[in-house]
Amino acid sequence: EVEKTACPSGKKAREIDESLIFYKKWELEACVDAALLATQMDRVNAIPFTYEQLDVLKHKLDELYPQGYPESVIQHLGYLFLKMSPEDIRKWNVTSLETLKALLEVNKGHEMSPQVATLIDRFVKGRGQLDKDTLDTLTAFYPGYLCSLSPEELSSVPPSSIWAVRPQDLDTCDPRQLDVLYPKARLAFQNMNGSEYFVKIQSFLGGAPTEDLKALSQQNVSMDLATFMKLRTDAVLPLTVAEVQKLLGPHVEGLKAEERHRPVRDWILRQRQDDLDTLGLGLQGGIPNGYLVLDLSMQEALS
């Protein structure tokens, strides 16, 4: 806390300008009017105030707006935003995407801070859903943003927003998250033709069920191995050797290098060795010829 002291003669600030960087903390407290600061917030970011000076300016705004800052002030906080606590931010009502962008810009190039996470949470909750423009903005600043959401939070993403998602935005998503996103992507891209559809849906296929993979295998998509390795194991296991061959096209040769890794390893164990041999890749570990395969899961489902 800065002590209340009278402003020295001739030092009363008539505007927020660069001369204020030479003010001591107590002089800023005594000589800068909070209402003036609020109306000229856009100037603060243009002036190289120190950490300690920003503390004083924040203190003045806190006194002026104990219930939380108005959006007209929030939009122009600039580097003063970095001084806010999550508790401060929870008092705000941020509705404008421009305000969100302005504050995200302040922290650009740095990890998502607790302040930023709170700001985003407040903004998205205020909007009711994660619309396309918001998602566009958030993933531009934080490519991993989507994968930081829980499956429950992702369920509020409308299919139309999926158009804003880039492949790199899904890099850190786990299968539970892709399970939620895949049906939305399927719906969003449903009117595209085969090859265009595959380009768009490819990043989401970690959430695809077996029947959709079977359908893709009929469309000459030539899925790369990196995508195949991210598929759900339970979705890959029922695929036949012929279906996997069609799904991967010329990339099928890559199975050999991945034969010890899931889902390829588990898939191999489910195939007849005879069928695997038709690929000519030397894949080993399939069911020997003459063995009968009992699908116990099917038997349990029937009983």
Epitope: E18, N45, A46, I47, P48, F49, T50, Y51, L54, Y79, L80, L82, K83, V106, N107, G109, H110
Partner: nanobody, 114 residues
């Protein structure tokens, strides 16, 4: 963010030095920046500043002798110091933008006028 100040040294009264401050990223090309100094046993004080719009301001003690400038392409800020006096002896630091708001500082560069 990394801030690297350089160019300090030992100089005679009346001499000149040019300090440089390089920053990682595009920090100085978009932000307001300032040079500070800290003499032994004293608090750090601002000596020169440049707003994001490019206007400059100087502490009374260095007015007419020091000049702050920047090269956006090199993401570097300079402080040209002429007519140096013994009382200019200090460690000089530059800062601005994100790192300043977060209270991150470089190592500084030492200037001795003797």
């Amino acid at each position: 963010v990394q801030l690297v100040e350089s160019g300090g040294g030992l100089v005679q009264p009346g001499g000149s030095l040019r300090l440089s401050c390089a920053a990682s990223g595009s920090m100085f090309s978009i932000n307001a920046v300032a040079w500070y100094r800290q003499a032994p046993g004293e608090q750090r004080e601002p000596v020169a500043a440049m707003t994001s719009g490019g206007s400059t301001i100087y502490a009374d003690s260095v007015k007419g002798r020091f000049t702050i400038s920047r090269d956006n392409a090199k993401n570097t800020v300079y402080l040209q110091m002429n007519s140096l006096k013994p009382e200019d002896t200090a460690v000089y630091y530059c800062n601005g933008g994100w790192s300043q708001a977060m209270d991150y500082w470089g190592q500084g560069t030492s200037v001795t006028v003797s």
